[in-house]
């Protein structure tokens, strides 16, 4: 879906800080302080989506546009 993300705290995965990229895809709750603006250096990280920074892991995560999937929203979602 358009609100999918690859985030280090999904589906019970316990991911390390900083810089780990986990592989579960799920809808994330928007808890205050859980995400922040992505650092400028990650401006082009998300190919077909928008970037957010996972505060607990200090690593970027992508919220994919509808019809795209992958860690960087780089793949067309064949199931969309």
């Amino acid at each position: 879906s358009g609100n999918s993300t690859r985030s280090p705290e999904t589906n019970g995965l316990s991911c390390g800080y900083p810089g780990e990229n986990c592989t579960a895809t799920t809808v994330q709750p928007k808890r205050k302080g859980h995400f922040s603006r992505c650092p400028k250096q990650y401006k082009h990280y998300c190919i077909k989506g928008r970037c957010r920074f996972v505060v607990a892991e200090q690593t970027p995560s992508c919220i994919c546009d509808e019809g795209y999937t992958g860690a960087r929203c780089e793949r067309v979602d064949l199931f969309y």
Epitope: P18, S36, Q58, E74
Partner: antibody, heavy 116, light 106 residues
């Protein structure tokens, strides 16, 4: 425990090439961003490059752009830095470090000396 | 590029002293700042991330504060093992380090 072990350093002439390696163990290498950071003798730290977990997102410091290439082989748990057109000012200890924004584990470094 | 300026470049202190090191960014970096400790011949060690969060395993005498352009690392009571060089690092734009602050024994 997390370990990062750099190798490949040595003495090289200006204009020459060198390939550094960083062997990782103690964590799931394929899930982490990894960086190279260097330190010239008696000087401060300088970030060189990072690569994301899949090897598709890469950035370089301006000082090495076009001369250095970072890569990784997740099947071998190894990070690489191909250094071409080396200059005297590239002389430094080169560290690999876990992370892209911040660096929570570091290797002990490998010394690269560029001199004629 | 964002420049990071640390002050002082060196300081002398005694065991038990409160030590403060400052870091100024040439432009706003929100709270995208880390602090590292480095001892001679050793690799750096991450102390603080996100300006004020203590890295796991780091003693609570270390603390960080600040946001925007001005940041501070404080050691509340200097211990013998704290004599080292300290670096700040911004990670908003491409990663850059400060020039370092050497903490020496008085």
């Amino acid at each position: 425990q997390v370990q990062l072990l750099e190798s490949g350093g040595g003495l090289v002439q200006p204009g020459g090439s060198l390939r550094l390696s960083c062997a990782a163990s103690g964590f799931t290498f394929s899930r982490y961003w990894i960086s190279w950071v260097r330190q010239a003798p008696g000087k401060g730290l300088e970030w060189v490059s990072y690569i994301d977990s899949t090897g598709t997102f890469i950035n370089y410091a301006d000082s090495v752009k076009g001369r250095f290439t970072i890569s990784r082989d997740n099947s071998k748990n190894t990070l690489y830095l191909q250094m071409n057109s080396l200059r005297a000012e590239d002389t430094a200890v080169y560290y690999c470090a876990r992370g892209g924004s911040l660096f929570d584990y570091w290797g002990q470094g490998t010394l690269v000396t560029v001199s004629s | 590029d964002i420049q990071m300026t640390q002050s002082p470049s060196s300081l002398s202190a005694s065991v038990g002293d409160r030590v403060t090191i400052t870091c100024r960014a040439s432009q706003g970096i929100i709270s995208y700042l880390g602090w590292y400790q480095q001892k001679p011949g050793k690799a750096p060690k991450l102390l603080i991330y996100a300006a004020s969060s203590l890295q796991s395993g780091v003693p609570s005498r270390f603390s960080g504060s600040g946001s925007g352009t001005d940041f501070t690392l404080t050691i509340s009571s200097l211990q013998p093992e704290d004599f080292a060089t300290y670096y700040c690092q911004q990670y908003d734009a491409l990663n850059t380090f400060g020039q370092g602050t050497k903490v020496e024994i008085k």
